[in-house]
């Protein structure tokens, strides 16, 4: 079903992740082309009967869109012409998750490159002192993750140390019954110390750390994507 | 110019099975969904399924579920539309479309279910 | 499904007089973000594939004569023949592309009178 006699020209396609509910990118880059009317660009989807989004002629051309991805789809149309293909996909669903191809037509040629794309949640953890318990406590939270992650203890102090014994995590599932909320709190925590609670899931990894010392607290918190250079 | 071109008619006695091709000339078809519509004698025009050739990706009409197998081969640019269990009622003529807009079709391919 | 009615069953007009057709959707083919309505309309003619002339209810596609016109939105469309041509006889279908599976009116017969 291709075009016979022109040459193929490089597309390139980065893995990525979705945050559920929120706007994500699919990014694709091609060999740029001097006429925007001459560049066509089809985002398709495995499983997906329609197109996720097609641009030709200089601007959206939404007949063949799948009626999943109605509304929800968008090019950066200024820089199509630099050799940007990318995706803005708005409010990102689970089902979202799959085997994408970035097909690229220009006067040079044609093109297409595949992209695995995750789905899930992920969101910063925040840690902070507990003081309406008993024994000195840690209280680490992240309002969206799924799937659902592990969390794991470490300390600057007790490196290699095992804190499951002393710290208990819950998971609570939010009204939109797909992501939860991560509670874990970690007992007997000594002062002039710093905590770290990990989050982990196969899409991220977040880290909240708190330093706690007899004068001050101080917090940092970090995410990186697992498996994706976006 | 983009053009589908259909196998010719079909025979077929009742309980067999028909498959019928359409090959796709003069455009870039992989990306675009290759749909079955098929119309009995007299009758409106209904659509049976299509399929994303690119992916292998295919959908079916509630009524063909079970009894319709819709598949592409991107090496020859064709796709093919096979029904089984076939019944009177399915004689018609079946259509290859492309494009959940049929803006191109084949010329048809007239299948009589007769014993 | 969406369940596609026209009306009415078929249609006689006289040559260079207007005809029209009628088609409801059982449901909604606007999709309000865009406000483009999911409908297109098909002609007919005997021994050959249906041809499209009309998407988003009311674009004609290229080469399509433009005594040819489409409107409507929601639930109810016409298409319009300002001049009826000998050539325009045929049947004439509807079809909703607003969701899967893809569904037609059940046509349109238009001849001349």
């Known amino acids: 079903f291709g075009i016979s006699g022109r040459h193929s020209i490089t597309v390139t396609t980065v893995a990525s992740a979705g945050n559920i509910g929120e706007d994500g990118i699919l990014s694709c880059t091609f060999e740029p082309d001097i006429k925007l009317s001459d560049i066509v660009i089809q985002w398709l989807k495995e499983g997906v009967l329609g197109l996720v989004h097609e641009f030709k002629e200089g601007k959206d051309e939404l007949s063949e869109q799948d009626e999943m991805f109605r509304g929800r789809t968008a090019v950066f149309a200024d820089q199509v012409i630099v050799g940007n293909a990318s995706l803005r996909l708005k409010n990102v669903q689970l089902t979202d998750a799959g085997t994408y191809k970035c097909y690229i037509i220009t006067s040079k040629g044609k093109g297409n490159a595949n992209l695995e794309y995750k789905t899930g949640a992920f969101s910063m953890p925040e840690v902070n002192v507990d003081y309406n318990a008993s024994s000195e406590t840690l209280r680490c939270e992240a309002p969206r993750w799924f799937p659902q992650p592990t969390v794991v203890w470490a300390s600057q102090v007790d490196q290699g140390a095992n804190f499951s014994e002393v710290s208990n995590t819950s998971f609570e599932l939010n009204s939109e019954n797909v992501t939860m909320k991560v509670v874990s709190v970690l007992y007997n925590v000594t002062i002039n110390n710093t905590y770290s609670c990990m989050i982990e899931n196969d899409i991220a990894k977040a880290t909240g750390d708190i330093k706690v010392t007899e004068s001050e607290i101080k917090r940092r918190s970090h995410l990186q994507l697992l498996n994706s250079k976006a | 110019q983009v053009q589908l071109v259909q196998s010719g008619a079909e025979v077929k006695k009742p309980g067999s099975s028909v498959k019928v091709s359409c090959k796709a000339s003069?455009?870039?078809?992989?990306?675009?969904?290759i749909n079955w519509v098929r119309q009995a004698p007299g009758q409106g025009l209904e659509w049976m399924g299509g399929?994303?050739?690119?992916?292998?990706?295919?959908r079916y009409a509630q009524k063909f579920q079970g009894r319709v197998t819709i598949t592409a081969d991107e090496s020859t640019s064709t796709a093919y539309m096979e029904l089984s269990s076939l019944r009177s009622e399915d004689t018609a003529v079946y259509y290859c479309?492309?494009?959940?807009?049929?803006?191109?079709w084949g010329q048809g391919t007239l299948v009589t279910v007769s014993s | 499904d969406i369940v596609m009615t026209q009306s009415p069953d078929s249609l006689a007009v006289s040559l260079g007089e207007r005809a029209t057709i009628n088609c409801k959707s059982s449901?909604?083919?606007?999709?309000?973000?865009?406000?483009?309505?999911?409908l297109a309309w098909y002609q007919q003619k005997p021994g050959q594939p249906p041809k499209l002339l009309i998407y988003?209810?009311?674009t004609r596609e290229s080469g399509v004569p433009d005594r040819f016109s489409g409107s409507g939105s929601g639930t109810d469309f016409t298409l319009t023949i300002s001049s009826l041509q000998a050539e325009d006889v045929a049947v004439y279908y509807c079809?909703?592309?607003?969701?899967?599976?893809?569904?037609f009116g059940q046509g349109t017969r238009l001849e001349i009178k």
């Open positions: 449901q909604s083919v606007l999709y309000s973000s865009n406000n483009k309505n999911y």
């Open positions: 079809q909703q592309y607003y969701t899967t599976p893809i569904t």
């Open positions: 399929i994303n050739p690119m992916f292998g990706t295919a």
């Open positions: 988003w209810a009311s």
């Open positions: 003069g455009g870039t078809f992989s990306t675009y969904a």
């Open positions: 479309a492309r494009g959940r807009l049929h803006r191109h």
